[in-house]
């Protein structure tokens, strides 16, 4: 035997051809390409999917497999018949020719055919196993689908029942809401009536408070006047006693009395025995000119002459040079005592300056300068300060060295701008400097990011406008 070839026919089927001398034996075997390889996701011994396959797909694949099986069975039958027929013919030929080597060829062919048949049978067994596996899976899936359907039906029934319950509950709640609405309308009506009554009451109370405030101011003024009268009377009695004792002339006695009740500052008032805070009349040094000032007799031992106060925004501080010179406002409230008086006073002896500050959050701080004086008007009431202590910043918020005083009509600052016009109020502006206690008064919640407010930079920063400020002076030797 010369050779053994394996090839494909025109329709793609496998064919085995044995050539022996002049004889050629060709065997056509059934095709198995429709049977998927083990790499296919549908083969039983491949890794199975987690989710079940689509039911229709599974049925379709089952039908395909059945068709393949039928094909294979038919091929096998054909093959058996073919082998039997050929065997008969070959046996006759062998008997006729009785050639030894031909028999050997036939035995080989038979062996090949048997091997081929065994292979086909094994493949068919495989396919059967796959089909069985697929069928079992489909049965399981069908069972799962059936269970799922039952479960869904039960859920739908439960939900329907729940919806009915909710509808009943909703109807009940709607009724309740309607009842409540009626009650609410009645309540609102009564609240509105109460509100109107309260408004009337508040208006009355406001009127009473205003009247009381007026009375309080009057009482304060009267109190100060009475204190002064009491002091005058004490002095008069004292003078009379002295006059009787020494038999001095009445004229000298009354002159002494007049000298005694002249106060230069609040320290004088305090030393005279008048230790109640309030408004007192002070006399300019070396002059008969008078001014009214508020004396603080409580803070740090008392004797403080108040030269500035801000507390409620009731007084406009955007004033002229002349107004800042002589002073303005109410000494018991917001006011500026007057640059001329302060200048004359602080040039007589050494004074300390205390600045008391309050923010909108309830915090308080102070700056104390151990030496303070103002130059005369000729030098634009320039401020001079030395020796800072206190809680309102380690650095002075009044620029050092001191600057001239500026007002809206007297621009004495170091800015290309007009600080007094820009920031409002009269102050010892630099360019324009870290402070201005005479700026615009801004109420709470409107007091930030304001560069023309009441500013003390080294305590509250740039744009914070303070709630209250007091500037007061006292002799350094008090």
């Amino acid at each position: 035997y010369s050779n053994f070839r394996k090839s494909m026919d025109s329709v793609g089927r496998k064919q085995y051809q044995v050539q022996h001398g002049s004889c050629s034996y060709t065997f056509l075997l059934p095709e198995t390409d429709n049977c998927r390889s083990s790499s296919s996701p549908y083969v039983s011994n491949a890794v199975q999917r987690d989710a079940p396959l689509d039911y229709d797909d599974s049925v379709h694949r089952l039908q395909v497999l059945e068709s393949i099986m039928e094909n294979n069975t038919q091929w096998l039958m054909k093959l058996e018949n073919y082998i039997q027929d050929n065997m008969k013919k070959e046996m006759v030929e062998i008997q006729q020719n009785a050639v030894q080597n031909q028999t050997a060829v036939m035995i080989e062919i038979g062996t090949n055919l048997l091997n081929q048949t065994a292979e086909q049978t094994r493949k068919l067994t495989d396919v059967e196993a796959q089909v069985l596996n697929q069928t079992t899976r489909l049965e399981l899936q069908l069972l799962e689908h059936s269970l799922s359907t039952n479960k869904l039906e039960k859920q739908i029934l439960d939900q329907t029942s729940e919806i009915n319950k909710l509808q009943d509950k909703n109807s009940f709640l709607e009724k309740k809401v309607l009842d409540m609405e009626d009650k609410h309308i009645v309540q609102l009506q009564s609240i509105k009536e109460e509100k109107d009554q309260l408004q009337v009451l508040v208006s009355k109370q406001n009127s009473i408070i205003e009247e009381l405030e007026r009375q309080l101011v009057t009482a304060t003024v009267n109190n100060s006047a009475l204190q002064k009268q009491q002091h005058d009377l004490t002095e008069t009695v004292h003078s009379l006693l002295t006059m009787i004792a020494t038999s001095s002339s009445a004229k000298n006695s009354f002159a002494a009395k007049e000298e005694q009740i002249t106060f230069r500052d609040c320290a004088d008032v305090f030393r005279s025995g008048l230790t109640t805070s309030g408004i007192y009349t002070l006399t300019f040094p070396n002059s008969t000119e008078e001014t009214k000032a508020y004396c603080d007799m409580e803070t740090g031992g008392g004797g403080w002459t108040t030269i500035q106060r801000r507390e409620d925004g009731s007084v406009d501080f955007q004033r002229t040079w002349k107004e800042y010179k002589v002073g303005f406002g109410n000494p018991s409230g917001e006011h500026w005592l007057g640059n001329e008086f302060v200048s004359q006073l602080t040039n007589q002896q050494r004074y300390v300056l205390k600045i008391h500050l309050r923010d909108w959050e309830g915090n308080e701080a102070y700056s104390l300068y151990e030496h303070f004086y103002l130059s005369s008007e000729e030098f634009n009431y320039r401020i001079h300060l030395k020796g800072l202590t206190g809680t309102a910043g380690k650095i002075s918020s009044i620029s050092q060295p001191g600057n001239d005083f500026s007002t809206k009509d007297a621009d004495n600052d170091k800015c290309i701008c007009k600080c007094s016009q820009m920031l409002t109020g009269g102050w010892w502006f630099d360019a324009c400097g870290p402070s201005n206690l005479n700026g615009m008064y801004y109420p709470q919640r409107q007091n930030t990011n304001k560069f023309n407010g009441i500013k003390w930079y080294y305590w509250k920063g740039s744009g914070y406008s303070l709630k209250a400020t007091t500037m007061m002076i006292r002799p350094a030797d008090f």
Epitope: I416, C417, K418, P434, N449, S462, G463
Partner: antibody
Amino acid sequence: QVQLVESGGGVVQPGRSLRLSCAASGFTFTNYGMHWVRQAPGKCLEWVAVISHEGNNKYYVDSVKGRFTISRDNSKNTLYLQMNSLRAEDTAVYYCAREGIDFWSGLNWFDPWGQGTLVTVS
Amino acid sequence: EIVLTQSPGTLSLSPGERATLSCRASQSITGSYLAWYQQKPGQAPRLLITGASSWATGIPDRFSGSGSGTDFTLTISRLEPEDFAVYYCQQYSSSPITFGCGTRLEIK
């Protein structure tokens, strides 16, 4: 005499960086907020950024946020503008300017201004 | 942001004449926080007016500012040859600070 002198301008490619400087003299630098203002050729003036006198507060125009950084060295009396990820639209003359009022930072007028430095992004 | 619109874009006048420059804001400028600047070619802007009407130091009184709310005016009573330049308005009432695009004052 109050003076501001800018430097650091030049031609730069898009996406690259540049740092501008502004040397101040003739005034108490630590008391003033400082600004950068720019002017594109033949266009309007545009405020760019401000830094407070202490250097703790900084504000920028939206178009440069995240790309430009304003800073100052009070010991050297110098203001800086670090410009990253530059774009063609950043081409302009950059001026440094002092606030008109000291001890204030943010909303203010400007006086004086520097002579400007040209930045070309191309 | 507040947009400032300046008009006219260009104003052609002769020396000695009166110039009126307008600056209109898209919303009210609180506190009249408006400044005016003069800019000559190749130079930095120079401050003229702050607070809508206050002269900066050293500015001649022929320059005057007025207005409040949304309408502001810069007036030059008698034009001098050195007054021909570009004039800008700037608001510092709300963030961000904004400028107008300028009015060019040229010799007729």
